[in-house]
Interface confidence: low
Amino acid sequence: APTSSSTKKTQLQLEHLLLDLQMILNGINNYKNPKLTRMLTFKFYMPKKATELKHLQCLEEELKPLEEVLNLAQSKNFHLRPRDLISNINVIVLELKGSETTFMCEYADETATIVEFLNRWITFCQSIISTLT
């Protein structure tokens, strides 16, 4: 099992966050998802900059809208339970960025679809993990 060092713990949490985001992307990109067209009409705010753990504040602020969009996707082919999923992501995000942070998120001018939003945060996790390893 992974060691208890702070770096290893951070890496594990980022891997879990990454996996959760990939789970959502897999679910909504599933060719059997009849709600995808409608889901793509929802707009998400993207961070102007996302290079450090404190920037996860921007993801945290978009978790409620993400849950609302995922609630649309409920069907027998969408196996993710939005409330459980978002709750888990929120716990990981809080642990990673720290709950005492006073960082104010700056958003880009352009909004994004759910797919673009998820891909942006997946890339964020991957890049941070790469620096840890």
């Epitope: 099992a1 879990h16 996996l19 789970m23 897999n26 339970r81 459980d84 709750s87």
Partner: antibody, heavy 113, light 107 residues
């Protein structure tokens, strides 16, 4: 010690379903994602999907969408993988793996008429 | 899906030999590569993760290197217990995918 113990071998007829269990012990079951991987006789490893034992939600490889269901019982630290509409090409050893560093011993599922 | 291609598919070597197995990804996977060893009738065993980090308890004769699309597993001095099949695996992008395996046999 840290281990995953899987249920015993199964023989099924085409069209039937099989449910394989994987019981965790020696570590915090809910902390690590549980993957399922299968290996057909003489073949390589094929990822089927993953479940978050904490939240209970799962995602599956496209190939198995609609046929596989992964669930968990936190009270017994057990995850389950159910595969339906079995065909002969589903004959394989099915493994559970927690965090990739702990693997079950494998469960042979034979599909034959 | 990201394809993982291993080479060679099999090789014959003697105890004490230096053995190198390569794995190529169809697109960049950064350092998200792991190596597994599998013996007949047994579950795979994690050897290396994050390209080059040795799993606890794995002998130091095993090492991994590479980045992006090209990766290498090296066994510096092959031991009798190392004769097995080796798999690479990427977890950079879902779905997780494995190489087809490299069987290391006794010459």
């Amino acid at each position: 010690q840290v281990q995953l113990v899987q249920s015993g071998a199964e023989v099924k007829k085409p069209g039937a379903s099989v449910k394989v269990s994987c019981k965790a012990s020696g570590f915090t079951f809910t902390r690590y994602y549980m993957h399922w991987v299968r290996q057909a006789p003489g073949q390589g490893l094929e990822w089927m999907g993953v479940i978050n034992p904490s939240g209970g939600y799962a995602t599956y490889a496209q190939k198995f969408q609609g046929r596989v269901t992964m669930t968990r019982d936190t009270s017994t630290s057990t995850v389950y993988m159910e595969l339906s509409s079995l065909r002969s090409e589903d004959t394989a050893v099915y493994y559970c793996a927690s965090g990739w560093d702990v693997w079950g011993q494998g469960t042979l599922v034979t599909v034959s008429s | 899906d990201i394809q993982m291609t291993q080479s060679p598919s099999s090789l014959s070597a003697s105890v004490g030999d230096r053995v190198t197995i390569t794995c190529r990804a169809s697109q960049s996977i950064s350092s998200w590569l792991a190596w597994y060893q599998q013996k007949p009738g047994k579950a795979p065993k994690l050897l290396i993760y994050a390209t080059s980090t040795l799993e606890s308890g794995v002998p130091s004769r095993f090492s991994g290197s590479g980045s992006g699309t090209d990766f290498t597993l090296t066994i510096s001095s092959l031991q009798p217990e190392d004769f097995a099949t080796y798999y690479c695996q990427q977890s950079y992008s879902s779905p997780v995918t494995f190489g087809q395996g490299t069987k290391v046999e006794i010459k």
